[in-house]
């Protein structure tokens, strides 16, 4: 632990002014694991002037950083790049004349205290004023800056020409696109100072490339994957003062796939479990030994979990007997195609026979054993049939 500091497994605090520290505290190699440090408290360190790019990076678990009544003048732009857990920063009563929002833009800070610093009135600190105005909490800080006449002005009153928030405008076509197709988004940004523009595509799976000039940009997404349905794409304009973004949600249409269909399991009811993916929402059709299975209060489709374009459910059977043994086929279809899977179900042996499958079971099955198509958003029981409302246009569909 550095001189003038005390260290525990999760905290470092340096408050002794003598002899004091001249650099940000670093732990010796074989001491406490820096990843476990969650709080660093520094006070009364007049000779601590700089936080360098690599000073804080080892403290990846850091949540609270306090440097008060010290000599901090400069913070490197990427000083907190690796400290994504940072929530509270307190730089009260230091020697900061400027501070860029770039230090903090990637952090989800709940508190940034900057009281008592000799900020210079310029566009560089306008973001702090904007941040203050955005906070509706009553405990806003009394921040000041020195103008050209070396006069202290409340930051709340600061007016600087040609220094405002940028704007982003995303000109997106209808962002409903078929799997495998491509799409181009265009975005324009404006502002003074002139903003930079970038795309935030999150964890987009599909291949994408962007062309960006200062105020115009395009994003081309090719061979769009069904996994990207529901994802948000944002165009971001950023300058010294702050950022603006315009976002669209991507909807990908694709043919259904039955990713899971298994033999029945018994719980409160018997259940033939399935998982279906598709967009628009597929209609489900069940067949029993090749014949339409019209749903009833005794046999019906239940969807238990819907995860955007994925549906987990059951063909639920109430008290099935040997008469229900046989082949169950599930067909899922929408206008982009259809998928089909089949399982054999054995619920019960024949009466008077040890619980073994009877190879003759199809002989005694009556046709059209009570599901018609079931829109998988509808899980209510209905007598005899469940109408399908989801297959809107499948011209050109083959299976």
């Amino acid at each position: 632990c550095p001189t003038s500091c005390k260290c525990s497994a999760s905290r470092i605090w340096c408050s002794d002014p003598s002899p004091g520290i001249v650099a940000f505290p670093r732990l010796e190699p074989n001491s406490v694991d820096p990843e476990n440090i969650t709080e660093i408290f520094i006070a009364n360190q007049k000779r601590l002037e700089i936080i360098n790019e690599d000073d804080v990076e080892a403290y990846v678990g850091l949540r609270n950083l306090t440097i008060v009544d010290s000599g901090l003048k400069f913070v490197a732009h990427k000083a907190f790049l690796k400290n994504s857990n940072l929530q509270h920063i307190n730089f009260t009563r230091n020697k900061l004349t400027s501070l860029s929002r770039k230090h903090f833009r990637h952090l989800d800070l709940s508190e940034l205290i900057l009281v008592g610093n000799p900020f210079t009135c310029s566009c560089d600190i306008m973001w702090i004023k904007t941040l203050q105005e955005a906070k509706s909490s009553p405990d806003t800080q009394d921040l000041y800056c020195l103008n050209e006449s070396s006069k202290n002005i409340p930051l709340a009153n600061l007016q600087i020409p040609n220094c405002g928030l940028p704007s982003a405008n995303l000109a997106a076509p209808n962002l409903t696109v078929e799997e495998g197709k491509s799409i181009t988004l265009s975005c324009s940004v404006a502002g003074d100072p002139v903003p930079n523009m970038y795309w935030d595509v999150g964890n987009l799976v599909s291949k994408h490339m962007n062309e960006t000039s200062h105020t115009q940009g395009s994003l081309r997404i090719t061979n769009i994957s069904s996994d990207d349905s529901g994802k948000q794409i944002s165009c971001v304009a950023e300058n010294l003062v702050g950022e603006d973004q315009d976002s669209v949600n991507l909807t990908v249409h694709f043919a259904p796939t039955i990713t899971f269909l298994e033999s029945p399991t018994s719980d409160h009811h018997w259940c033939i479990p399935f998982t279906v993916k598709g967009n628009p929402k597929p209609a489900l059709q069940w067949f029993y030994n090749g014949a339409i299975l019209n749903e009833s209060k005794y046999i019906c489709t239940k969807i238990h979990v819907t995860n955007h374009t994925e549906y987990h459910g059951c063909l639920q059977l109430d008290n099935p007997t040997h008469m229900n043994n046989g082949d169950y086929t599930l067909i899922a279809k929408n206008e982009y195609g259809k998928d089909e899977k089949q399982i054999s179900a054995h619920f019960m042996g024949w009466p008077g026979i040890d619980d073994g499958a009877n190879p003759n079971y199809p002989d005694v099955i009556y046709e059209d054993y009570g599901t018609a198509a079931n829109d998988i958003g509808d899980t209510t029981n209905r007598s005899n049939e469940i109408p399908s409302t989801d297959v809107t246009d499948k011209t050109g569909r083959e299976h």
Epitope: I331, A373, D393, E398
Partner: antibody, heavy 116, light 111 residues
């Protein structure tokens, strides 16, 4: 009980059109494709195409493209197949069949005779 | 279009004896979804066809278990384990994998 009931026999002159109907019952009509198949006297079966009764979307066999029209009236759960510019070799029994890639259900057939 | 070729074209069978019908397609009937849509139909004089077997080997609801289907890819077989009098008729194989759907020539008649 699934049933497909077709309209009665027709006699038409060459160049005329014929419209055969197929009324479905016992299942949700709009949920399943309806196919049309024909069988010339003493011959085999020939697939003509299908209609999706929900959307009205159709797909016709190349041979009948431009000459066949498949439609439906969902309010009465009925599918129609109209064949235009009839020729003598269109004389056949026309069947509606459904409801998926195996033809589990068939209408009783409609005999269309084309003769001058 | 896929051509479906059936053999033999005629099959005299003694009641109670087995019978076998072969069907060959001009290309594979395995669909990209993993299913093979090869179906067998029976037609009796003056009646519409009736589905016996769907997707190679699945017996349709109500079809007696003396009917069975087998095969894969391009070669398929319908077997009747013990022919009964009511089995007399024309048998068609049919593919529903690729449009246009096509049928075997169906000349085969059990006498």
């Amino acid at each position: 009980q699934v049933q497909l009931v077709q309209s009665g026999a027709e006699v038409k002159k060459p160049g005329a059109s014929v419209k055969v109907s197929c009324k479905a019952s016992g299942y949700t009509f709009t949920a399943y494709d309806m196919h049309w198949v024909r069988q010339a006297p003493g011959q085999g079966l020939e697939w003509m195409g299908w209609i999706d009764p929900n959307s009205g979307g159709t797909r016709y066999a190349q041979k009948f493209q431009g000459r066949v029209t498949m439609t439906r009236d969902t309010s009465i759960s009925t599918a129609y197949m109209e064949l235009h510019r009839l020729r003598s070799d269109d004389t056949a029994v026309y069947y509606c069949a459904g409801v998926t890639s195996w033809f589990a259900y068939w209408g009783q057939g409609t005999l269309v005779t084309v003769s001058s | 279009d896929i051509v479906m070729t059936q053999s033999p074209l005629s099959l005299p069978v003694t009641l109670g004896q087995p019978a076998s019908i072969s069907c060959r397609s001009s290309q594979s009937l395995l669909h990209s979804n993993g299913n093979t849509y090869l179906n067998w139909l029976q037609q009796k004089p003056g009646q519409p066809p009736r589905l016996l077997i769907y997707k190679i080997s699945n017996r349709f609801s109500g079809v007696p278990d003396r009917f069975s289907g087998s095969g894969a890819g391009t070669d398929f077989t319908l077997k009747i384990s013990r022919v009964e009098a009511e089995d007399v008729g024309v048998y068609y194989c049919m593919q529903g994998t690729h449009e246009p759907y096509t049928f075997g020539q169906g000349k085969l008649e059990i006498k």
